[in-house]
Interface confidence: low
């Protein structure tokens, strides 16, 4: 698996007016690494392991770079013509990879309101876009804006590719093993919710890195988002993480429901226990 550095920049508009803030999250080898907050740019390690990678270094350069990128993306959003009422987002995701054979890959992806509409291979400069008319319109809009100053754009994207790889190599030089994977312990419990219904809660704990998929399935099919409640992924104080997902089901139908867990490429399913397992406190608010 290649080493990777991933930048996720988000800017927002409200009723057609681009908001002054932005959010940048940086992942190193798939793990949260730096965060530049909307309110105040604070490029800083996400957790102890990130501090181990770079020691006590200051984040001035990262802060400056991420702030600049945020401004660029705000200008891009301002040039999107189909701004409607309400809240809208423009997301730019840049990824660079170094493979075992030392070859590199770099790409850039734009999302509007969470929908991918434009991608670019930063090495070949090749653009691709989905077939939908909305995506095509957005893509034309953004590409035209980026082409307005072709020289600047060319330099900018070369720099994005080169800087990303340079940063990735610098971070990896620290020698810290980033690929530590600790699988989660998964525990399913049930508690009375109301007459004829029970609440089933699936808890995953002690896992690392923090990226995890946890959801309830009925007859093998994922339940809709609004019938489940998720807990935040939180540190558990041991350098690992914990989270949960809960749903209400009809008593007697327990055997139809399973908790599905996916973490670091591994997945498993966990049935609802039969009989009554007392849970002192329900997570439903």
């Amino acid at each position: 698996e290649p080493h990777s550095l991933r930048y996720n920049l988000t800017v927002l508009s409200w009723d057609g007016s681009v908001q002054s803030g932005f959010l940048t999250e940086v992942h190193l080898d798939g793990q949260p690494f730096l965060r530049c907050d909307r309110q105040k740019c604070r490029a800083k390690p996400q957790g102890q392991w990130a501090e181990d990678v770079l020691g006590n270094k200051t984040w001035d350069r990262e802060t400056r770079d991420l702030t600049g990128n945020g401004k660029d993306l705000r200008m891009t959003l301002a040039h999107i013509k189909d701004q409607k009422e309400g809240l809208h987002s423009l997301q730019e995701i840049r990824v660079c990879e170094i493979h075992e054979d030392n070859s590199t890959r770099s790409s850039q992806h734009f999302y509007y309101d969470g929908e991918l509409f434009l991608s670019q291979n930063l090495e070949t400069k090749e653009w691709t876009m989905p077939q939908s008319s909305r995506a095509q319109t957005l893509a034309m809009n953004v590409r035209n804006f980026l082409k307005e100053d072709a020289m600047k754009t060319k330099t900018h994207y070369h720099a994005m590719h080169a800087d990303c790889l340079q940063e990735l190599r610098r971070y990896l030089k620290s020698g810290v093993v980033l690929r530590r994977t600790v699988p989660p312990m998964v525990n399913v419990t049930r508690s009375e919710a109301s007459e004829g219904n029970i609440t089933v809660t699936c808890r995953a704990s002690g896992f690392y890195p923090w990226n995890i998929t946890l959801s309830w399935r009925q007859d093998g099919v994922s339940l809709s988002h609004d019938t489940q409640q998720w807990g935040d992924v939180l540190p558990d104080g041991n350098g690992t993480y914990q989270t949960w997902v809960a749903t209400r089901i009809c008593q007697g139908e327990e055997q139809r429901f399973t908790c599905y867990m996916e973490h670091s490429g591994n997945h498993s399913t966990h049935p609802v226990p039969s009989g009554k397992v007392l849970v002192l406190q329900s997570h439903w608010q």
Partner: antibody
Framework: QVQLVESGGDVVQPGRSLRLSCAAS????????IHWVRQAPGKGLEWVAV????????YYADSVKGRFIISRDNSKNTLYLQMNSLRAEDTAVYYC??????????WGQGTMVTVSS | AIQLTQSPSSLSASVGDRVTITCRAS??????LAWYQQKPGKAPKLLIY???SLESGVPSRFSGSGSGTDFTLTISSLQPEDFATYYC?????????FGPGTKVDIK
């Protein structure tokens, strides 16, 4: 100017209910988790509850769980705290607070809630 | 829940003194700790976040250190406006508990 302004504090009898509001301005309210923190007269700070930026997740201190409900209306840039079954020990100044995930750098001025018979 | 203890609970000091306040967590919290200053009748004010990062606009005489379970707030040279109560708060996991506070008053 970034600010939070609490309102709704009052003198109420034990067992009664009260709803506090917190109006936000000067920042993108819908991007932030917002918290309630309280301080009893002459005592220290106590974290009360948090609601996620999108309203999906809520967490409460054990001392208020089951009695208080935190909610928000992002269209109105407003946070709420519905306080039910009030007790004398809920008497405090209630602050709303927000900021990045690792600190509260925005605080309201506070609103006083007195629970007394 | 993670408990935070602060020491001392109060201290008397003079202008120009170096003041150190400690905060101890009941379990490891990495660097997820903030320090606040509060004056009577006012809302708390953020001084330090992430255990050692100085909040924008806060004088450099304030500094924070520590990681894991033991943390320190230091005021290198106490000024008249620094007489207040200081609180630590952990952001490692819910509930986001506060320390009981340390009151710094004039000797």
């Amino acid at each position: 100017q970034v600010q939070l302004v609490e309102s709704g504090g009052d003198v109420v009898q034990p067992g009664r209910s009260l709803r506090l509001s917190c109006a936000a301005s000067g920042f993108t309210f819908s991007n932030y988790n917002i918290h309630w923190v309280r301080q009893a007269p002459g005592k220290g700070l106590e974290w009360v509850a948090v609601i996620r930026y999108d309203g999906i997740n809520k967490y409460y201190a054990d001392s208020v769980k089951g009695r208080f409900i935190i909610s928000r209306d992002n269209s109105k840039n407003t946070l709420y705290l519905q306080m039910n079954s009030l007790r004398a020990e809920d008497t405090a100044v209630y602050y709303c607070a927000s900021g990045p995930p690792d600190a509260f750098n925005i605080w309201g001025q506070g609103t006083m809630v007195t629970v007394s018979s | 829940a993670i408990q935070l203890t602060q020491s001392p609970s109060s201290l008397s000091a003079s202008v120009g003194d170096r003041v150190t306040i400690t905060c101890r967590a009941s379990q490891g919290i990495s660097s997820a700790l903030a320090w606040y200053q509060q004056k009577p009748g006012k809302a708390p004010k953020l001084l330090i976040y992430d255990a050692s990062s100085l909040e924008s606009g806060v004088p450099s005489r304030f500094s924070g250190s520590g990681s894991g379970t033991d943390f320190t707030l230091t005021i290198s040279s106490l000024q008249p406006e620094d007489f207040a109560t200081y609180y630590c708060q952990q952001f490692n996991s819910y509930p986001f508990t506060f320390g009981p506070g340390t009151k710094v008053d004039i000797k």
